[in-house]
Interface confidence: low
């Protein structure tokens, strides 16, 4: 995250950092819990890396540096990437982790509400962006999970911002014109959230963005409202019955 | 674990042949440009060879085109490079590697093997 | 095919000085330069991708610039632990590496 400050514990209890063990562990997306063994994340997370035990789940966790070899954390069960991603494409950049097991909820481990399906007509003012990601482009990754307020943009003024690709219907925007504010490496994955009528729901995927927090060039984020009916089948068809966190 | 395990290596006279192995784990290696790389003693590091991910497009450095051969079986997760005609300037630890690089903000990786050394000698 | 010349060839210097190498492209090759540190018995490790991104988990005082020919790998404040052979790497067209740079203690 650019330009942000640290966060409290329980303040984004759904936030999770999913960890790869390569040679050495470390952190590579953000992704948001939305059920008891429902993680939500980006599909471009896993390219390449989709075999289940490589991965690592840390959940109800503020500060990287307190992860030890006794911290625990969640395996995967199946991850479910989007059947319309593609890796050269920035399209549909969305998956689903199930856990090996549930998650108990806590004050510091909890879910995030989803929005409505074809949520298009609620007007979003406060929004943001969490993650452990860089805080600039040429930076590293974070110890404290990292908040920034930004604001939404419409598509129209976002694909004038990115010429050379298509911002679609399935896609959300922000970012800040003069720049300085924005997700970066490490938060891809993480929730977009907006707090609307006193409660916070998973507005977008942080996804893509050409470098971080520069001028003009907002973050792109996957539009969970425009995904509704694929996680509620995903997860129903896994689960026999729905476990999500909506608000409807 | 995401892993790249070279062998095959040893003692070759010059004119012999030798193949390499590099099997990889804990990574969806069907999908990527797969490559071997070489250094000889106290030298620095020279491309080999590369394979895309079906195997149909392989590519060859000047110095080994017409002697060396790199294939790829996806369904056993490993990589080959079969050398023939060997000779003593081919003496050197070799390396089989891999890169994934994203789009913009997306995470890369880069994954050696621990190399196999490979002497031609008389 | 696409050569890569790097210089110099060994570099002498003291932890705490600012180092940088240079690596000049036979013909463009935008900015699909990788920069690597490889130290003896080892096999190398990406540093940066792209001309100027960093590899996840490398730290920040390593910095990488330049596109078309002419790129150029800065480390701001040598460590200790920086002490180790350098190669630019380009992959616009397969790959070639430059011939290294022996970063050394002064």
């Known amino acids: 995250i650019v330009g942000g400050t640290n966060s409290s514990w329980g303040e984004w209890p759904w936030q999770v950092s999913l960890q790869v063990k390569l040679t050495a562990q470390r952190h590579l997306c953000g992704g948001s819990l939305i059920g008891h063994q429902w993680v939500l994340t980006a599909a471009h997370c896993f390219d390449g890396l989709p075999l289940q035990d490589v991965w690592r789940i840390y959940s109800g966790i503020l500060n990287l540096s307190d992860i030890t070899k006794d911290t625990p954390f969640s395996q995967i069960k199946e991850i479910i990437i989007h059947q319309n991603y593609k890796v050269s494409e920035g399209n549909h950049d969305i998956a689903l982790i199930k856990l090996q097991a549930p998650l108990n909820y806590t004050e510091f481990q909890k879910p995030i509400c989803l929005p409505s399906k074809g949520d298009t007509s609620t007007i979003y003012t406060n929004c943001w962006v969490t993650g452990w990601g860089f805080s600039k482009e040429k930076g590293e990754i974070q110890n404290i999970l990292q908040k920034v307020n930004i604001p939404l943009v419409t598509n129209e003024e976002c694909q004038k911002r990115y010429q050379d690709y298509k911002i679609t219907q399935r896609m959300v925007c922000a970012g800040y014109k003069e720049g300085g504010k924005d997700a970066c490496k490490g938060d891809s994955g993480g929730p977009l959230v907006c707090k609307h009528n006193g409660m916070w729901r998973l507005v977008g995927i942080t996804s893509w963005g050409e470098g971080c927090a520069r001028r003009e060039q907002p973050g792109v984020y996957t539009k969970v409202a425009e995904y509704m009916d694929w996680i509620l089948e995903k997860t129903q068809s896994s689960d026999g019955k729905a476990q999500m966190q909506s608000p409807a | 674990e995401v892993q790249l395990l070279e062998s095959g290596g040893g003692l070759v006279q010059p004119g012999g042949s030798l193949r390499l192995s590099c099997a990889a784990s804990g990574f969806t290696f069907s999908h990527y440009i797969m490559m071997w790389v070489r250094q000889a003693p106290g030298k620095g590091l020279e491309w080999v060879s590369g394979?895309?991910?079906?195997?149909?497009?392989?590519v060859y450095a000047d110095s080994v085109k017409g002697r060396f051969t790199i294939s790829r079986d996806n369904s056993k997760n490993t990589l080959y490079l079969q050398m023939n005609s060997l000779r003593a300037e081919d003496t050197a630890v070799y390396y089989c590697?891999?890169?994934?690089?994203?789009?913009?903000?997306?995470?890369?990786?880069?994954?050696w093997g621990q190399g196999t050394m490979v002497t031609v000698s008389s | 095919d696409i050569q890569m010349t790097q210089s110099p060839s060994t570099l002498s210097a003291s932890v705490g000085d600012r180092v940088t190498i240079t690596c000049r492209a036979s013909q463009s090759i935008s900015s699909w330069l990788a920069w690597y540190q490889q130290k003896p018995g080892k096999a190398p490790k990406l540093l940066i991708y792209?001309?100027?991104t960093l590899e996840s988990g490398v730290p920040s005082r390593f910095s990488g610039s330049g596109s078309g020919t002419e790129f150029t790998l800065t480390i701001s404040s040598l460590q200790p632990d920086d002490f180790a052979t350098y190669y630019c790497?380009?992959?616009?067209?397969?790959?070639?590496f430059g011939q290294g740079t022996k970063v050394e203690i002064k």
């Open positions: 792209k001309a100027s």
């Open positions: 590697a891999w890169r994934r690089i994203g789009v913009p903000r997306r995470d890369s990786f880069d994954m």
């Open positions: 394979i895309y991910s079906s195997g149909g497009i392989t």
């Open positions: 790497q380009q992959y616009n067209t397969y790959w070639t």
